[in-house]
């Protein structure tokens, strides 16, 4: 008789990540019989939700459940009908939510109610929605990149199964740049961490990690834009504001309520004689990093050493690994390539900030106007932030890794975050058996 | 085991406020939502509103200007009030909860408390 | 606000019969719709859920069907602890909205 083909024994789990920007779903997939197993987790679906990020629906809280339906029909699509009830869905909020809960707990818990009454609408196993905290989301993002990199793994091959890998178990360190915040977070060498805020301990399948993680809140890049402006008009004559993140010929009426709507921009609030500016570009890469360098306190420092605002950061250990925005801003710029120095991506940021408007605009014609016009002003800030924030040096600006997928996953807080909410690292090594029960059938 | 048991009077004078209360266990209430249902010969299954487990509430709109409901998480109770009550208010009310945090039908239902509108 | 129309307030079956519920909603509400049994002083029980995922313990000749504004419930070879009264809800929008019920009784 003909071997019939056994059902395959899997499971899924959903993450939705929603940001201050936007919310995205993600889907795993992993074998039933290999939970614990590192590395067999894996993406299956990325559905980017249409719309702004959830905190953008304080006034509009009804519109949330159609906001959710496309994704989560997507959802359904995917995961097999027999599968739906068990699968497991979480949704994480992040800096978006974090700055709307410093305004407004009340607001914040509104837009989370409201979300799980339309996440729970569906026929999966709707674990909740919270808003994480930035420690948890770098926490995540390194167990996220190390998880796919192979490294929690005991058994050292001799070949490499990903790009970025070393034979080494040494974990990578992980920079991840969302719109409201970014966090960093690295295995540092021999050295204790000054402030218990920043430490973290983890037994990962039988070892110990002392991790280092800080998540600067309004350091995302659009915060960090909001922050730039509500700076500079301080000192501006009049309602123009010649700006020299942004390329020569552009031109951007920016509304000074707007300004002031985040409490990232409350340290530079100030009464203007006017309710509107309009940004002028000029395009000058040099002049943009000074202007952005103004957001970093380096001045004051209690810990042996600092990034900035006085927040401890311990010297840099090891490769890093560098996602969400300061990938996808660096890949626009094609700059993530291994072979490109610290200086040529210098040299190409100066090139690209003084190309006038109506070039760029020509030149990339398929892209939203309102991200294009952003470009320079992001990578700029990724440079400052990564070279006199983290203190990265010409050489070892080499140890950074732009990654967008590692083995066709997202690099990014939420596979972490699922692999640990669904008990699938274990503290312990597991017992390895010389065959699995599928290797019977 | 999730339960719900609801308490209250079972006879309320015309004009008067009824306030019922739902004492729950298996489950907390900061982790789940509860809704309220009210069942009556005239007109069938209603449902009146629910407290979230943040505590924001929805209330059905021919009601909302005479119900309250509101919480206490640590006491694990749910108390509903509503006010001016007519004769057509004569019903068997329910707490009720969905199987997870924020379901909006009813996997569990406490066994409900008949009351009765009338001088 | 959504009405849920359950258009026969009584119907008769026998033990073994194979008998359909219906519900029909007066706008789309998708598959945001769950079936209840209730029968007499007790608290309604849910059946269905999503349309036509069966809450689980739910014996599985019950099975739900439909989307949109058409719903059913079917119960194939119906057993006497089956005799009751089964309402639907839709659970798309607030307020949510219940059928009127469908009495099942023996022939």
């Known amino acids: 008789t003909q071997n019939k083909a056994l059902p395959e024994n899997v499971k899924y789990g959903i993450v939705l990540d929603a940001g201050s920007s936007h919310t995205s779903l993600y889907i795993y997939k992993w074998p039933a019989e290999k939970e614990n197993d590192t590395g067999v987790v894996h993406q299956v679906e990325e559905c980017r939700v249409k719309g702004p990020g959830i905190s953008k629906f304080v006034q509009k809280v009804n519109e949330i459940g159609i906001y959710l339906t496309d994704c989560m029909e997507r959802a359904r699509e995917v995961i097999p009908r027999s599968q739906h009830q068990e699968t497991p869905v979480y949704l994480g909020a992040t800096a978006g939510m974090r700055l709307l809960r410093m305004e407004s707990e009340e607001l914040a818990d509104r837009v989370l109610d409201v979300v799980e009454r339309s996440l729970s609408n569906y026929p999966f196993d709707f674990q909740g929605a919270r808003i994480i905290t930035g420690q948890e989301e770098g926490a995540y993002g390194w167990i996220t990149i190390n998880y796919l990199l192979g490294k929690f793994s005991q058994k050292t091959r001799w070949f490499s199964i990903v790009p970025y890998e070393t034979n080494n178990q040494e974990t990578f360190g992980a920079l991840d740049l969302g719109g409201a915040s970014t966090q960093v977070t690295f295995v540092p060498q021999n050295q204790t961490i000054e402030s218990p805020d920043n430490a973290l301990q983890f037994r990962l399948y039988g070892k110990d990690y002392n991790v280092y993680t800080h998540s600067f809140l309004c350091y995302g890049k659009d915060q960090a834009l909001w922050q730039k402006l509500a700076k500079d008009i301080q000192v501006a004559s009049n309602e123009i504001l010649r700006d020299p993140c942004f390329h020569p010929g552009y031109k951007k009426v920016v509304n000074v309520s707007d300004l002031y709507k985040t409490p990232c921009t409350k340290r530079f609030e100030m009464t203007l004689p006017f309710q509107q500016f309009e940004i002028q570009g000029i395009g000058n890469y040099q002049q943009c990093h000074q202007s952005i360098l103004e957001l970093f306190n380096t001045s004051y420092c209690p810990y042996s050493q600092c990034a900035f605002n006085g927040i401890f950061l311990p010297p840099l250990q090891g490769d890093f690994g560098a996602f969400s925005a300061f990938y996808f801003v660096m890949k626009f710029l094609n700059l993530t390539s291994e072979k490109v120095s610290q200086e040529k991506v210098t040299e190409m940021m100066k090139k690209f900030c003084a190309q006038p408007w109506e070039e760029i605009k020509t030149s990339y014609a398929g892209v939203k106007e309102k991200y294009l016009s952003e470009y320079c002003f992001s990578g700029t800030y990724i440079l400052s932030l990564l070279l006199q924030g983290y203190h990265f040096t010409a050489d070892s600006w080499e140890h950074i890794h732009f990654i967008g997928k590692i083995q066709g996953s997202d690099a990014g807080w939420t596979l972490g975050y699922m692999l640990n909410l669904t008990n699938m690292i274990p503290a312990e090594q597991p017992l390895s058996t010389p065959l699995s029960h599928s290797t019977y059938v | 085991d999730v339960q719900l048991q609801e308490s209250g009077p079972s006879l309320v004078q015309p004009s008067q406020s009824l306030s019922i209360n739902c004492t729950v266990s298996g489950f907390s209430l900061s982790s789940y939502g509860v809704h309220w249902v009210r069942q009556s010969p005239g007109k069938g299954l209603e449902w009146l509103g629910v407290i979230w487990r943040r505590g924001s509430t929805d209330y059905n709109a021919a009601f909302m200007s005479r119900l309250s409901i509101t919480k206490d998480n640590s006491k694990s109770q749910v108390f509903f009030k509503m006010n001016r009550l007519q004769a057509d208010d004569t019903a068997t009310y329910y707490c009720?909860?969905?199987?997870?945090?924020?379901?909006?039908?009813?996997?569990?239902w406490g066994q409900g408390t008949l009351v009765t509108v009338s001088a | 606000d959504i009405v849920m129309t359950q258009s026969h307030k009584f119907m008769s079956t026998s033990v073994g019969d194979r008998v359909s519920v219906t519900c029909k909603a007066s706008q789309n509400v998708g598959t945001n719709v769950a079936w209840y049994q209730q029968k007499p002083g007790q608290s309604p029980k849910a059946l269905i859920y999503?349309?036509?995922y069966r809450y689980s313990g739910v014996p599985d000749r019950f099975t739900g069907s439909g989307s949109g504004t058409d719903f059913t419930l079917t119960i194939s070879n119906v057993q006497s602890e089956d005799l009751a009264e089964y309402f639907c809800q839709q659970y798309n929008s607030y307020p949510l909205t219940f059928g009127a019920g469908t009495k099942l009784e023996l022939k």
């Open positions: 999503s349309a036509s």
């Open positions: 009720a909860k969905g199987i997870s945090t924020a379901t909006s039908w009813f996997a569990y």
